[in-house]
């Protein structure tokens, strides 16, 4: 009774198509599969960025797989062949592992790469990234930004740089069609007569870096002798009302400060008849139903009631 063995996949490699971190893992079927013609062979693929403690594991019948990686670090992957138990009249048979690695050969000392990279997707409409030059680099150093997301044929270079002292220190992006809810890849590289410049890679999803406009049209309405309803409107733009959280800051007679977080465009405040002055501001943020993270907007203009009976007047700014 001979032991059934199977070879690992052949020509296992990681291919970089130039998408700034979105890589292809591909392989060929193992040698000597003739004995298992009636069998559907599967492959178990494990991969990770070097330094990560956990492997991602995929079982597939295909000869390729695609995923995003951090190109600031190396990538390691391994794969083996799986013969299901139906093919072997017994337990599942696994081949030995085939292994491969990939990394971008760096140039430049780490300090030369851009510092404090910061990207904000303003009002879910306009992406702006800014950075500081690397430490110790001369003014002849120029940085270039490239980006890619699924849907683009190839990586694109920024065409509208923000400059300071002749150096690129940021990028205003054009309209980015169908670019949210998917990984957005950026590489900032550089050149200098003086010294090599280290490239930096960044990956994020646009909906997670949205900074909305502040709410508008703040109003007061007296609901009862001891209740005032504060109302506002969602800012202009593409963000639907269901995507907002709000933070309100209310000041009563220059003493009491109330802060509250709400999901709707209203807030009911308990007051006393003695209230002489009431002011409030609101800011907005994309909520957990529409993103994993976000940036608070600036505060709205302050809306105040002063010196009149709130029941007699609804203020509209």
């Amino acid at each position: 009774d001979t032991e059934i063995k199977v070879n690992p996949p052949q020509d296992f490699e990681i291919v970089d198509p130039g998408y700034l971190g979105y890589l292809y893992l591909q392989w060929q079927p193992p040698l000597s599969l003739d004995h298992f013609k009636e069998c559907t062979v599967e492959y178990e693929l494990k991969y990770r960025n070097i330094g990560s403690e956990t492997w991602k594991t995929i079982i597939t019948k295909n000869l390729h797989y695609k995923d995003g990686f951090d190109l600031n670090k190396g990538i390691e992957a391994k794969i083996h062949t799986l013969l299901p138990w139906q093919c072997t009249n017994g337990s599942e048979v696994q081949s030995s592992w085939a292994e491969t690695t990939y990394w971008i050969s760096p140039q430049g000392i780490p300090e030369t790469k851009v510092q404090d990279m910061d990207c904000v997707y303003y009002n879910w409409q306009y992406l702006l990234c800014s950075w500081k030059p690397g430490i110790g680099v001369l003014l002849d150093t120029n940085y270039n930004l490239f980006y890619w997301y699924e849907g683009l044929d190839h990586a694109l270079q920024c065409v509208d740089y923000i400059k300071a002292d002749g150096q690129n220190i940021g990028c205003r992006f054009p309209y980015l069609e169908a670019s949210d809810y998917k990984d957005f890849y950026i590489c900032v590289n550089g050149s200098s007569e003086n010294k090599p410049i280290r490239s930096s890679y960044f990956t994020f999803q646009l909906q997670n870096i949205v900074k909305p406009l502040p709410p508008v049209y703040l109003t007061f309405t007296r609901e009862s002798s001891c209740e005032i309803k504060l109302k506002w409107s969602i800012p202009l733009g593409p963000i639907p009302a269901r995507c907002f959280d709000y933070e309100i800051e209310i000041r009563e007679d220059d003493t009491t400060l109330v802060t509250a977080t709400v999901e709707n465009e209203t807030y009911t405040l308990k007051t006393t008849n003695e209230t002489r002055q009431l002011c409030f501001v609101v800011r907005s943020k994309v909520n957990i139903y529409c993103s994993d993270d976000g940036i608070w907007s600036e505060w709205s203009d302050k809306q105040c009631w002063e010196g009149e009976d709130l029941s007699k007047k609804t203020l509209l700014r």
């Epitope: 330094g51 190396g74 050969s105 780490p110 030369t112 010294k195």
Partner: antibody
Framework: EVQLVESGGGLVQPGGSLRLSCAAS????????VHWVRQAPGKGLEWVGV???????DYNSALMSRFTISKDNAKNSLYLQMNSLRAEDTAVYYC??????????WGQGTLVTVSS | DIQMTQSPSSLSASVGDRVTITCTAS???????LHWYQQKPGSSPKLWIY???NLASGVPSRFSGSGSGTSFTLTISSLQPEDFATYYC?????????FGGGTKVEIK
């Protein structure tokens, strides 16, 4: 097996020149950068410079004007050209492979003595 | 330049002792770029600990590294005869790359 072998060291007079070689095997200089590091007798380690895989170079600015690093990818070899040598350049010169921003393999070193 | 200052410059210890070597940087260094090398007389340096706390291949688990910012340490939990050597810290963050002056671990 990764190996780095330095050669070209010896006795040279002050003001003279010397060219050190570093023969690499088990990896390609088109994929990895290689550093030169020196160690004066009984002293610590001093970084000289690095030739990156892509061909660009970083130097210790204190030595940059007198030392030049080059490589020949076809021969998988790295070179250190040292000019206007001084007594304080006397040291063992090592080449070391760059891997993930550390020096993971070192050669055995070659001794350069600058003396009249 | 970032100065790397090691202390002590030498120490005498016995087999089984716990040994701690400190490395202080003159400017903050990312832990990713702080490494330790071991060198024995007549031999070239060997990468011993990389990125502050990761042991290089073949390094015994009695060695550990820690630290952040400007202060880093290499610790040997129970000194063995083969550990007697000189240890250098090294920053790979800023040019020029620099090494500490070394700590020589000798047999008491």
């Amino acid at each position: 097996e990764v190996q780095l072998v330095e050669s070209g060291g010896g006795l040279v007079q002050p003001g003279g020149s010397l060219r050190l070689s570093c023969a690499a095997s088990g990896f390609s200089l088109t994929k990895y950068g290689v550093h030169w590091v020196r160690q004066a007798p009984g002293k610590g380690l001093e970084w000289v410079g690095v030739k990156w895989a892509g061909g660009s170079t970083d130097y210790n600015s204190a030595l940059m004007s007198r030392f030049t690093i080059s490589k020949d990818n076809a021969k998988n070899s790295l070179y250190l050209q040292m000019n206007s040598l001084r007594a304080e350049d006397t040291a063992v010169y090592y080449c070391a492979r760059d891997h993930r921003d550390a020096m993971d393999y070192w050669g055995q070193g070659t001794l350069v003595t600058v003396s009249s | 330049d970032i100065q790397m200052t090691q202390s002590p410059s030498s120490l005498s210890a016995s087999v089984g002792d716990r040994v701690t070597i400190t490395c202080t940087a003159s400017l903050s260094v990312s832990s990713t770029y702080l490494h330790w090398y071991q060198q024995k007389p007549g031999s070239s340096p060997k990468l011993w600990i990389y990125s502050t706390s990761n042991l290089a291949s073949g390094v015994p688990s009695r060695f550990s590294g820690s630290g952040s910012g400007t202060s880093f340490t290499l610790t040997i939990s129970s000194l063995q005869p083969e550990d007697f050597a000189t240890y250098y810290c090294h920053q790979y963050h800023r040019s020029p790359l620099t090494f500490g002056g070394g700590t020589k671990v000798e047999i008491k």
